[in-house]
Interface confidence: low
């Protein structure tokens, strides 16, 4: 599923991401835009053999199990395939664990490079939330 901007903002808010660990909803929508272009089925291979999955590009080395990544920790205790669902519950729940891990949203390279320090509220402007 490819979400619309406001559609995703509403879904993320429904799942409790707004101001989760101090990160406003705009940060999450911005991260999803530059990680996956709002596509729940996005996958990208990394040079270390791991793969990033889903709308927030969650990594199989640490957070989920895809049965294919040597030394996977599976800290979210989920199959990576769950992160590709049009239902973003699994991605959101895992993201909450990631953002609580110490580095906050710096765990997402795209957020660090494209969203951090910008007017992230623009990503939810005009949305009925």
């Amino acid at each position: 599923k490819v979400f619309g901007r406001c559609e995703l903002a509403a879904a993320m808010k429904r799942h409790g991401l707004d101001n989760y660990r101090g990160y406003s909803l705009g940060n999450w929508v911005c991260a999803a835009k530059f990680e996956s272009n709002f596509n729940t089925q996005a996958t990208n291979r990394n040079t270390d053999g791991s793969t990033d999955y889903g709308i927030l590009q969650i990594n199989s080395r640490w957070w989920c199990n895809d049965g294919r990544t040597p030394g996977s920790r599976n800290l979210c205790n989920i199959p990576c395939s769950a992160l590709l669902s049009s239902d973003i519950t699994a991605s959101v729940n895992c993201a909450k664990k990631i953002v609580s891990d110490g580095n906050g949203m710096n765990a997402w390279v795209a957020w660090r490079n494209r969203c951090k320090g910008t007017d992230v509220q623009a990503w939810i402007r005009g949305c009925r939330l």
Epitope: N39, Q41, A42, R45, G49, G67, R68, P70, S81, L84
Partner: antibody
Amino acid sequence: QVQLQESGAEVMKPGASVKISCKATGYTFTTYWIEWVKQRPGHGLEWIGEILPGSGSTYYNEKFKGKATFTADTSSNTAYMQLSSLTSEDSAVYYCARGDGWYGYWGQGTTLTVS
Amino acid sequence: DIELTQSPATLSVTPGDSVSLSCRASQSISNNLHWYQQKPHESPRLLIKYTSQSMSGIPSRFSGSGSGTDFTLSINSVETEDFGMYFCQQSNSWPRTFGGGTKLEIK
């Protein structure tokens, strides 16, 4: 139960292209990788590459880049592999398999003869 | 690419014998090694995943061991239905690679 059904045997002329299909049933097609494997007598099994049908993401063995192209149709739960510029070296049995790191489910194989 | 070398290439045994098939990797692959059986004109069948995890429906006489670079598939008291080709496969890195196979035949 999980099943992968491949298309029938093909006899092709050198230089031609062929498209092999693999229809999946019994599981969520979009969220598992489909792997393609080549088997020639005396050459064992060779991994060609894989496609994740839900996203269209593909990864190819360098050896088969330019030779094999993967596509998938999620409306019919079918994965495809097209082989181009066929030569006698492409004569083989081609298998699709569901990828979990290991391959627990295989198609019955498609025999391709190039002559 | 990781190369998997299987030995012996052919193993001639009598039903009731116990045998060990070897698979050696060109570099460490942890436990990311899987074993398949293939009969003539059939698709491969997964026997063991991740070195030692038996698949459901596979007879208990099949077992796997090893780690790093050296792996073994053991068949305790071979039965006539066990004859065929055996392949190992690694999932430690891409491209996925298979061993050249061991042919288990009747003596």
